[in-house]
């Protein structure tokens, strides 16, 4: 069937269209094109005779049409009037006619649209704005974009006038955005430049910063006001209702108590005509005086005196605070606070109570600290210490002894030999000593402030012969695999070599044995029961040598896993059962028995006469060493058979 296809169907003005013929019959004489839906000679555009290949223009020919041998018609420079139907009339050789109709539509190329607005400065929550997309164009579709997004769904947005008008009801500051419109028809689409909606709003309630409302006398007051507003707000300040200045910031230097009051910021928007105010109450406090501490006793004596520290000045309705060593007061029965916290009493002062002490006065804003006060606690003298600790010296050497006792004020020292005063110095020096210098050397320390004195006596032996040493121990009963033991060879003597023997042999090489303190101290780490031996120390110098009596180490160990004897587990009925439990342990362990879980006696030996099969079961021996704090146990099964039922059974003990 003969058909006409328009390419394209929608044609832009000024462009061209091809009316393409499909299924053109064979053996044609010629054909003609007509404007409209029927053959009308008055509306003939062009005719074409195939035999002569002659094209003849008709009354509707515009000079823009070209006919092709295949009957297709090209129309150039399309105008709006070209819209409509076109009919092809085909005349076959047998003079039979055939017709086909096609059509196309002509649309203008759209111009770039623009947006007009009925209100360039709408007021928030009051005005509506109508945007209109210009120009009005027939057969065009109108679209809107907000911030390059399609329109959001909102009851405040309304499209009208074929979507050409966008109305925003009750505008808000959030409607401040970029708006664009777009026009579309089948042959073109154009988007407008953006229009920014300028919504007038505010002022909102102003915010005054900083939020701080309490100030101290002498500080600067610097308040800043801000209110959201378009256009920006104009600001005014009022103090106690009296206008001050039209600025966003209010600055008052060196404020006094008289500057206390209500501070009002007023924000004004000249375009919306609205005013909003915020009030803050500023309180200026007088600067309290710096506190200081007074004491009822500037030189208290340790363990005798009490000291009362008072925070000055006395101010009504004031909170007093105390610090010792930069910390809040510790809980102590020796520290007492008065009802108003103004007086801190130290009962029975000690040398550790020196401080420093601080008191504070708290006001509404901060705490004012006093300068620190240090107590001068008089103490001592403690028992003097004489050094060095040597007690044995060889003739011909120099004896130099020094005495020290903790004391405040520092102690005054005196030396006595065998009760006779020698000198009032801290150090005693005797050169080239002899045996005659042996004796009791006393250091006396005296505290002139407290009137107390203390003495220490040291026996000095001057002899070419060394004394018999002895061994002291830091742990007389160490626990195996747990404790360490330190043996020390006494006395400490000058220019002396210290030696050790274990069971009469020199020390074995062992990572658990360590010599220190010039070989004077022997330490055994992680003692074992095998360390329970005889230890001897020896001292020697160039002229003599001596050995201590042996010290035997008593190592606590065990209890090891017990052994129940005899080892037999099968018995004949009627025999006596006599079980003995033994566990290696130092000291001896506590023993107890259980038969089939039932507690029996607290003995090492369990005896049952004339056993029967009823005595079958589990026999448990439990051992505990109270010194090591350890326990152990073992379980043995006993079977008792009726007499004569089975050979090879034990007859019992």
């Amino acid at each position: 069937k003969l058909t006409i296809e328009s390419t394209p169907f929608n044609v832009a003005e000024g462009k061209e269209v091809l009316l393409l013929v499909h299924n053109l019959p064979q053996h044609l004489f010629g054909y003609s094109w007509y404007k409209g839906e029927r053959v009308d000679g008055n509306r003939q555009i062009i005719g074409y005779v195939i035999g002569t290949q002659q094209a003849t223009p008709g009354p509707a020919y515009s000079g823009r049409e070209i006919i092709y041998p295949n009957a297709s018609l090209l129309i150039q420079n399309i105008i709006q009037n070209d819209t409509g139907f076109y009919t092809l009339h085909v005349i076959k050789s047998d003079l039979v006619n055939e017709e086909a109709t096609g059509q196309f539509r002509v649309y203008p190329e759209l111009p770039k649209p623009s947006i007009s607005s009925n209100n360039s400065k709408p007021v928030e929550d009051k005005d509506a704005v109508a945007f209109t997309c210009e120009p009005e164009t027939q057969d065009a579709t109108y679209l809107w974009w907000v911030n390059n997004q399609s329109l959001p769904v909102s009851p405040r947005l309304q499209l009208s006038n074929g979507n050409r008008t966008l109305t925003l009801f009750n505008v808000t500051r959030n409607d401040t955005a970029s708006y664009k419109c777009e026009t579309q028809n089948p042959v073109s689409a154009r988007r407008s430049d953006s229009v920014i909606l300028n919504v007038l709003y505010g002022p909102d309630a102003p915010t005054i910063s900083p939020l701080n409302t309490s100030y101290r006398s002498g500080e600067n007051l610097n308040l800043s006001c801000h209110a959201a507003s378009n256009p920006p707000a104009q600001y005014s300040w009022f103090v106690n209702g009296t206008f001050q200045q039209s600025t966003q910031e209010l600055f008052i230097p060196n404020i006094t108590v008289n500057n206390s009051g209500s501070y009002t910021c007023q924000a004004h928007n000249s375009d919306t005509g609205l005013n909003r105010t915020t009030v803050t109450t500023i309180t200026v406090y007088a600067e309290p005086p710096k506190p200081f501490i007074t004491s009822n006793n500037s030189n208290p004596v340790e363990d005798e005196d009490a000291v009362a520290l008072t925070c000055e000045p006395e101010i009504q309705n004031t909170t007093y605070l105390w610090w010792v060593n930069n910390q809040s007061l510790p809980v102590s029965p020796r520290l007492q606070l008065s009802n108003d916290n103004r007086t801190l009493t130290l009962l029975s002062v000690t040398r550790n109570d020196v401080g420093p002490y601080e008191c504070g006065i708290q006001n509404e804003l901060s705490v004012d600290h006093s300068d620190p006060v240090i107590l001068n606690v008089l103490y001592g003298p403690d028992d003097p210490t004489i050094s060095p600790s040597y007690t044995y010296y060889r003739p011909g050497v120099n004896l130099s002894l020094s005495c020290h006792a903790a004391s405040n004020p520092p102690a005054q020292y005196s030396w006595l030999i065998d009760g006779n005063i020698q000198q009032h110095t801290q150090e005693l020096f005797i050169s080239n000593i002899t045996e005659k210098n042996s004796g009791l050397y006393t250091c006396q320390a005296n505290n002139s402030a407290s009137g107390h004195s203390r003495t220490t006596v040291k026996t000095i032996t001057v002899s070419a012969e060394l004394p018999k040493p002895s061994i002291s121990s830091n742990n007389s009963k160490p626990v195996e695999d747990k404790d360490a033991v330190a043996f020390t060879c006494e006395p400490e003597a000058q220019n002396t070599t210290y030696l050790w023997w274990v069971n009469g042999q020199s020390l074995p090489v062992s990572p658990r044995l360590q010599l220190s303190n010039g070989n004077r101290t022997l330490t055994l780490f992680n003692v074992t029961r095998n360390d329970a031996r005889a230890y001897v120390c020896g001292i020697q110098n160039s002229v003599s040598a001596n050995r201590s009596d042996p010290v035997t180490l008593d190592v606590l160990y065990g209890p090891d896993t017990p052994i129940i004897s005899p080892p037999d587990s099968s018995y004949l009925s009627g025999a006596n059962l006599n079980l003995s439990c033994h566990s290696a342990s130092n000291p001896s362990p506590q023993y107890s028995w259980r038969i089939n879980g039932i507690p029996q006696q607290h003995t090492q030996v369990l005896f049952i006469a004339k056993i029967t099969p009823n005595n079958n079961g589990t026999y448990a021996c439990f051992v505990s060493n109270l010194a090591t704090g350890r326990n152990n146990s073992i379980v043995k099964s006993i079977t008792v058979s009726a007499s004569g039922t089975s050979p090879g059974l034990s007859a019992g003990a």
Epitope: P587, L626, A627
Partner: nanobody
């Protein structure tokens, strides 16, 4: 006659406290080690705490550390076991046991029952 007499046992709720006493007569506890051993049905005997007078050392089973405290008053010839935060598993007969510091004698008390139950 040598005697060890325990007292202080009884019924207590979980979380409660008891103080057991072990009064010794017939000898001086000064040179001894004293322990408390507990026996509960179906469980092994356990040495829960011990103290040695000559060294002052105290030792505790892991199960009671931080809850039980052993002490002795040589002037009263009495040992004590302070039991706090008691649990159901502490239910047992508690025996006082004493060993000399050379291990040449061992004594036991007759036991006191502690029941922890709600």
């Amino acid at each position: 006659e040598v005697q060890l007499v325990e007292s202080g046992g009884g019924l207590v709720q979980p979380g409660g406290s008891l103080r057991l006493s072990c009064a010794a007569s017939g000898f001086n506890i000064k040179d001894t080690c004293i322990g408390w051993v507990r026996r509960a049905p179906g469980k092994e005997e356990e040495l829960v705490a011990s103290i040695c007078q000559y060294s002052g050392y105290t030792r505790y089973a892991d199960s009671v550390k931080g809850r039980f405290t052993i002490s002795a008053d040589t002037s009263k010839n009495t040992a004590y076991l302070q039991m706090n935060s008691l649990r159901a598993e502490d239910t047992a007969v508690y025996y006082c046991a004493i060993t000399s510091h050379h291990g040449d004698y061992n004594y036991w008390g007759q036991g006191t029952t502690v029941t922890v139950s709600s």
